[in-house]
């Protein structure tokens, strides 16, 4: 009785931002749920949390300093992470808990998504070349 989660094996975060879609083998319509994204092989860092229920708007927050937003589909939650640093390149795992109605359900651990954060390369702009030499 575990929800299955599908994630892309790898994503590259250009411009230090990425959309990570967590697809569930379960329809979240009419449920209260807590979807979360965890960083690291041991899932030690809870990057972002999305609370969903049918009476309020999605509640999205991070207690670990990540800039994140969330979007809900019938069988998916997409996490939008911004302002990522190169050293935050890691494996990220989606987690889902259906809190209501009973019975409580959660997911089998997914394979995770490696997010590779590419640093911004600050190149001199061709519009403003340096002083020309005679």
């Amino acid at each position: 009785n575990k929800i299955l989660v599908k994630q892309s094996p790898m994503l590259v975060a250009y411009d230090n931002a990425v959309n990570l879609s967590c697809k569930y083998s379960y329809n979240l319509f009419s449920r209260e749920f807590r979807a979360s994204l965890h960083k690291g092989l041991d899932s030690a860092v809870e990057v972002c949390v999305v609370y969903g229920n049918y009476s309020q708007q999605l509640q999205v927050y991070s207690k670990t300093g990540f800039n994140c937003d969330g979007k809900l589909g019938n069988e998916s939650v997409t996490f939008y992470l911004q302002n990522l640093y190169v050293n935050q390149t890691d494996i990220y795992f989606c987690k889902i808990e259906v809190m209501y109605p009973p019975p409580y359900l959660d997911n089998e651990k997914s394979n995770g998504t490696i997010i590779h954060v590419k640093g911004k390369h600050l190149c001199p702009s061709p519009l403003f070349p340096g002083p020309s030499k005679p």
Partner: antibody, heavy 118, light 112 residues
Framework: EVQLQQSGPELEKPGASVKMSCKAS????????MNWVKQSNGKSLEWIGI????????TYNQRFKGKATLTVDKSSSTAYMQLKSLTSEDSAVYYC???????????WGQGISVTVSS | DVVVTQTPLSLPVSFGDQVSISCRSS???????????LSWYLHKPGQSPQLLIY???NRFSGVPDRFSGSGSGTDFTLKISTIKPEDLGVYYC?????????FGSGTTLELK
């Protein structure tokens, strides 16, 4: 139109088991959990348990653990409840009821009368 | 288990009356999401219970606006503004927040 069609009345001997059904139509069966409720003669309603039809996961009222077993058949959009080791205390009307929004049972079956008598 | 106390047990009425039924729970029915799962049902003789009000105050589809629900925490009320013949029967409240879910003992609305 949402409908829950329950099987017919049952007359059983003490110690026997009975399995009753609740066929759902008019909605996506796996999107809503199904409750079962007991009403003994002249008494209030009593919640037996709930099943998630997608996975078949269940939660029971402690009072009915070991007495009631909830199952589903997704292919026929049917929920089942089996009662075992029947006694006269199990004589009652049993309802299936869909769990809608906000923890409410929004659609109910017509009820199944179970009589346990020797 | 959460005990749900419904009062009165019996309510003799005349058509056109306005009545209130009270439902009290032994603990708050607000969950961690801020939702309160309290609903009201009418059970007419020979029929199945029918949902009237869900989430304290939301009328279910097809339910006339003479039915209204209110309350919070542990105290809830169902009001019927103008009693009609089809309103006679047994009214139940249900708390769906804490397991096991529990019904009130019922209020019988009957003619004086």
């Amino acid at each position: 139109e949402v409908q829950l069609q329950q099987s017919g009345p049952e007359l059983e001997k003490p110690g026997a088991s009975v399995k009753m059904s609740c066929k759902a139509s008019g909605y996506s069966f796996t999107d809503y959990n199904m409750n079962w409720v007991k009403q003994s003669n002249g008494k209030s309603l009593e919640w037996i348990g709930i099943i998630d039809p997608y996975y078949g996961a269940t939660t029971y009222n402690q009072r009915f653990k070991g007495k009631a077993t909830l199952t589903v058949d997704k292919s026929s959009s049917t929920a089942y409840m089996q009662l075992k080791s029947l006694t006269s205390e199990d004589s009652a009307v049993y309802y299936c009821a869909r769990f809608g929004f906000y923890g409410a049972m929004d659609y109910w079956g017509q009820g199944i009368s179970v009589t346990v008598s020797s | 288990d959460v005990v749900v106390t419904q009062t009165p047990l019996s309510l003799p009425v005349s058509f056109g009356d306005q009545v209130s039924i009270s439902c009290r729970s032994s603990q708050s029915l607000a969950n961690s999401f801020g939702n309160t799962y309290l609903s009201w049902y009418l059970h007419k003789p020979g029929q199945s219970p029918q949902l009237l009000i869900y989430g304290i105050s939301n009328r279910f589809s097809g339910v006339p606006d003479r039915f209204s629900g209110s309350g919070s925490g542990t105290d809830f009320t169902l009001k019927i503004s103008t009693i009609k013949p089809e309103d006679l029967g047994v009214y139940y409240c249900l708390q769906g927040t804490h397991q096991p879910f529990t019904f009130g003992s019922g209020t019988t609305l009957e003619l004086k």
